[in-house]
C-alpha cells in the first residue's frame, strides 16, 4: 500500500498574487499526475514536467507562469494507476486562490449554472470567490437566501426551484453572477426500466427501432450496447414525458440495417446519483431478404371419414408478413360455396398458424389441397391429397345364365373409399342357409369356380364369380368391406333344370 503523495508547499490553501508565477511540487512512491481547475483548452499557461532528484521518489512539477482568476481552485496530486472514471480522485490536495479586483467570482462553464437537485436533497450553488476574504450573499426573487458559504465550493443548502444570484463586494465594487438555475429532478431508489422492440426481425435496408423507458426517475444515465455501436451506427434520442407521470424514453434508431446489425441490443440504466443499475436486452435479427418456411402438422396423404369434422393445421414462419391462401385442385377455395373454412392467426412476431377446416366431410371434398404463402421476397406452398373415406356398400348383385352349358356368373358391384374388398361365400344346403355355420368362404383355387375383381373407377369395384355348372340350388353371398364397414347380399342360384330364379335379400 503506497502512502499518499506529498505536496510542496505543504499547505491546505495558498493565496497567489495576480499575474505572478507559482509552482507546485508533488512527491510520490510511484508515477504521479496533477489534476487542476481549468480544462485542456484553457491551460496553455500551465506546464507540467517531471523532475529528477536523489530521494528515489517520483517528482512532478506544475508551473503557472501568470496566475489569473481562472487558476483559482483545487489542485490534486494522485498516483496514475489509482485514477478511475467512477470514483473521486484519491490524492493530496492544495487549494489556490488568485484574487482579482476585477473578477470576484471564478469563471464557470454554461452548464455549471444549471444546478440539479434530487427531490429535497441539499445542493451546492457553485459561486466561488477568487479571494477567500470576499463576503458573498445569495439572492433569489424574494431577497437574501440564508445558506452556508464556503469559498472553495459555494453556497450549500436546500434550495427551491428557480434562479439564484451570488453577490460580492470587492473594494466597494459590487459583482453579480449570472443566474444559477436550480432545477428539481425526481429520483427513486429503484429503477423501473422497460425495453420495447416493436419488431425483432428485420430485413436489409429497414430501420431498427428499440426503446428503453425509465419511469418516475429523472436522474438517469442510460447507455446502449449494440452491434453497430463501434462503427458509430445508430441514432440515440431521449424524450422526456411529464404527463401523467415522469417517463424518460430513450430511443435507438438504426436506419439502413444490414445483416451485421443482427445481435443483442442492450440498454443499461444507472441512477446518476446512486449506485442503482438496471439492464434490459433484446435480440434482433436482420435477414438479407424476406423468407417463408412452411411446416405442416400432417402428411401429404390424408384421409377423413364421411361426415367427420377435421382440421388441417399448417405453421408458417415468415417475414415480412405473408399473404396466405388455399387452393383445391389448383383453384382458389370459394368458402361460401362449401362447408370448408380457412383462417390465419398470428402466433408470434413472425409465426403464423393457418387452419383448413372441414365441417362435415363429403365425398366431393376429396382432392388436392394447397396452401400458398407469399410475401414480396418469397413464395412457398405445400400440397396434400385428401380422401374422404366412405363405408362400403353393395350397389348391385345379379346373376347371368350361360344357357345350355349350365354355367352361371354372379356379379357384385360395390362402392366405398378406400375401395372395398369383395369376398364370396357359398351355402350348399339351401334349407340350412339361415344358420351361419352353413356358409363357407369360396376359395380361389376351387376347380370349376372362377373369381375375379375389376375396379370401375376410384370408388367402385365389381367382383365376379363364375360357376361352370350348377347342378343343385345353392345360395351365394357377396361380402364387400373396407376400413369403415362391411355389407353383404345373398342370391339363390337354381340349377338350370329347375328353370327358376330366386333372389334372397
Amino acid at each position: 500500500q503506497l502512502s499518499l503523495p506529498s505536496i510542496l508547499p505543504n499547505e491546505n490553501e495558498k493565496v497567489v498574487q495576480l499575474n505572478s508565477s507559482f509552482s507546485l511540487r508533488c512527491f510520490g512512491e510511484s508515477e504521479v499526475s496533477w489534476q487542476y481547475p481549468m480544462s485542456e483548452e484553457e491551460s496553455s499557461d500551465v506546464e507540467i514536467r517531471n523532475e529528477e532528484n536523489n530521494s528515489g521518489l517520483f517528482v512532478t512539477v506544475l508551473e503557472v507562469s501568470s496566475a489569473s482568476a481562472a487558476h483559482t481552485g483545487l489542485y490534486t496530486c494522485y498516483y496514475n494507476h489509482t485514477q478511475t472514471e467512477e470514483n473521486e480522485l484519491e490524492g493530496r490536495h492544495i487549494y489556490i486562490y488568485v484574487p482579482d479586483p476585477d473578477v470576484a467570482f471564478v469563471p464557470l462553464g454554461m452548464t455549471d449554472y444549471l444546478v440539479i437537485v434530487e427531490d429535497d436533497d441539499s445542493a451546492i450553488i457553485p459561486c466561488r470567490t477568487t479571494d477567500p476574504e470576499t463576503p458573498v450573499t445569495l439572492h433569489n426573487s424574494e431577497g437574501v437566501v440564508p445558506a452556508s458559504y464556503d469559498s472553495r465550493q459555494g453556497f450549500n443548502g436546500t434550495f427551491t426551484v428557480g434562479p439564484y444570484i451570488c453577490e460580492a463586494t470587492v473594494k466597494g465594487k459590487k459583482f453579480q453572477t449570472i443566474p444559477f438555475n436550480v432545477y428539481a429532478l425526481k429520483a427513486t431508489s429503484e429503477l423501473d426500466l422497460e425495453m420495447e422492440a416493436l419488431k425483432t426481425v428485420y430485413k436489409s435496408g429497414e430501420t431498427i427501432v428499440v426503446t428503453c423507458a425509465v419511469f418516475n426517475n429523472e436522474v438517469v444515465d442510460l447507455q446502449w450496447t449494440y452491434p453497430g455501436e463501434v462503427k458509430g451506427k445508430g441514432i440515440t434520442m431521449l424524450e422526456e414525458i411529464k404527463v401523467p407521470s415522469i417517463k424518460l424514453v430513450y430511443t435507438l434508431t438504426v436506419p439502413e440495417a444490414t445483416v451485421k446489425d443482427s445481435g443483442d441490443y442492450e440498454c443499461a440504466a444507472r441512477q446518476a446519483t446512486r449506485e442503482v443499475k438496471e439492464m434490459k436486452k433484446v435480440t434482433i435479427s436482420v435477414h438479407e431478404k424476406g423468407f417463408i418456411e412452411i411446416k405442416p402438422t400432417f402428411s401429404q396423404l390424408e384421409a377423413v371419414n364421411l361426415h367427420e369434422v377435421k382440421h388441417f393445421v399448417v405453421e408458417v414462419r415468415a417475414y415480412p408478413p405473408p399473404r396466405i391462401s388455399w387452393l383445391k385442385n389448383n383453384l382458389t377455395l370459394i368458402e361460401n360455396l362449401t362447408e370448408i373454412t380457412t383462417d390465419v392467426e398470428k402466433i408470434q412476431e413472425i409465426r403464423y398458424r393457418s387452419k383448413l377446416k372441414l365441417i362435415r366431410a363429403k365425398e366431393e371434398d376429396s382432392g388436392h389441397y394447397t396452401i400458398v404463402a407469399q410475401n414480396e421476397d418469397a413464395v412457398k406452398s405445400y400440397t396434400f391429397e385428401l380422401l374422404t373415406q366412405v363405408p362400403s356398400s353393395i350397389l348391385d348383385l345379379v346373376d347371368d345364365h350361360h344357357g345350355s352349358t349350365g354355367g352361371q356368373t354372379v356379379r357384385c358391384t360395390a362402392e366405398g373409399t378406400p375401395l372395398p374388398d369383395i369376398e364370396w361365400m357359398i351355402c350348399k344346403d339351401i334349407k340350412k342357409c339361415n344358420n351361419e355355420t352353413s356358409w363357407t368362404i369360396l376359395a380361389n383355387n376351387v376347380s370349376n369356380i372362377i373369381t375375379e375383381i375389376h375396379s370401375r373407377d376410384r370408388s367402385t369395384v365389381e367382383g365376379r364369380v363364375t360357376f361352370a355348372k350348377v347342378e343343385e340350388t345353392i345360395a351365394v353371398r357377396c361380402l364387400a368391406k373396407n376400413l369403415l364397414g362391411a355389407e353383404n347380399r345373398e342370391l339363390k342360384l337354381v340349377a338350370p333344370t329347375l328353370r327358376s330364379e330366386l333372389t334372397v335379400a
Epitope: 453497430g228 462503427k231 458509430g232 451506427k233 441514432i235
Partner: antibody
Framework: QVQLVQSGAEVKKPGASVKVSCKAS????????MHWVRQAPGQGLEWMGW????????NYAQKFQGRVTMTRDTSISTAYMELSRLRSDDTAVYYC???????????????WGQGTTVTVSS | DIQMTQSPSSLSASVGDRVTITCRAS??????LAWYQQKPGKVPKLLIY???TLQSGVPSRFSGSGSGTDFTLTISSLQPEDVATYYC?????????FGQGTKVEIK
Amino acid sequence: QVQLVQSGAEVKKPGASVKVSCKASGYTFTGYHMHWVRQAPGQGLEWMGWINPNSGGTNYAQKFQGRVTMTRDTSISTAYMELSRLRSDDTAVYYCARDRAFWSGYHGLDVWGQGTTVTVSS
Amino acid sequence: DIQMTQSPSSLSASVGDRVTITCRASQVIANYLAWYQQKPGKVPKLLIYAASTLQSGVPSRFSGSGSGTDFTLTISSLQPEDVATYYCHTYKSAPWTFGQGTKVEIK
C-alpha cells in the same frame, strides 16, 4: 400546402419570459416532431430542442435546460416555445421546424416557420 | 457533444464552377448528417439528408457524400441563385449540432 406560421416579433426586458407560437397546417400535426432552432444576429444556427406533438414529450439542449419549455395544443395544431429569464444574448430569430421523418431515422428539418425575432434589451 | 467543423468559412467562385464544402465531425456519426442552405434574409432550406440523399425539389447539381467523420457538399455548377450560407448538421445524438456555416459568393 404544408406550412408553419409563427407569432410576431417580441421585445422583452432582461429577466422576462417570451412565448413563441408555431401553427402547423397542411399535414397531420401529431405525425411529425417539431424542433426549435435559433439564430443570433450574424451568427449560425443553434438547436434548442424538440417536442413530440403526439405524446407531448420533449428533449431540450442542456444549455437551455431549466429555462425553456416546449408545449403543444393538438386541437389547434400549434407548438409553443417559452424561454424564461431572458438575457441580452438571447436576442435572436427563433424558428420552429418540422422533422421530416423522425422514426425512420432519416432526419432533416424539411419545413421551417418564417422565424420570430426576439429582442432582449433593457 | 459532437462538434461539427466546416471549411472553408467562406468562398468565392465563378458561375459554372464546381464548389466543394467540407464538414468534419468530432466523432464517428456514420451517415447521420444533413445539409441546409440559407439565403440572405431567408429561412434555412433542407438540401440533403442521410449524408447523400437529395431532398425532393432540390436541383440535382447539389450532391452530398461521406461517412464516418468526413463529409462533403458539392455544387457541380455554381448558379447565381446558389449564393447563400450552407450549414452541415448532425442528428446522431442530442444535442443536435450545426457547423458554423460556409458563406458562398459569386466572383
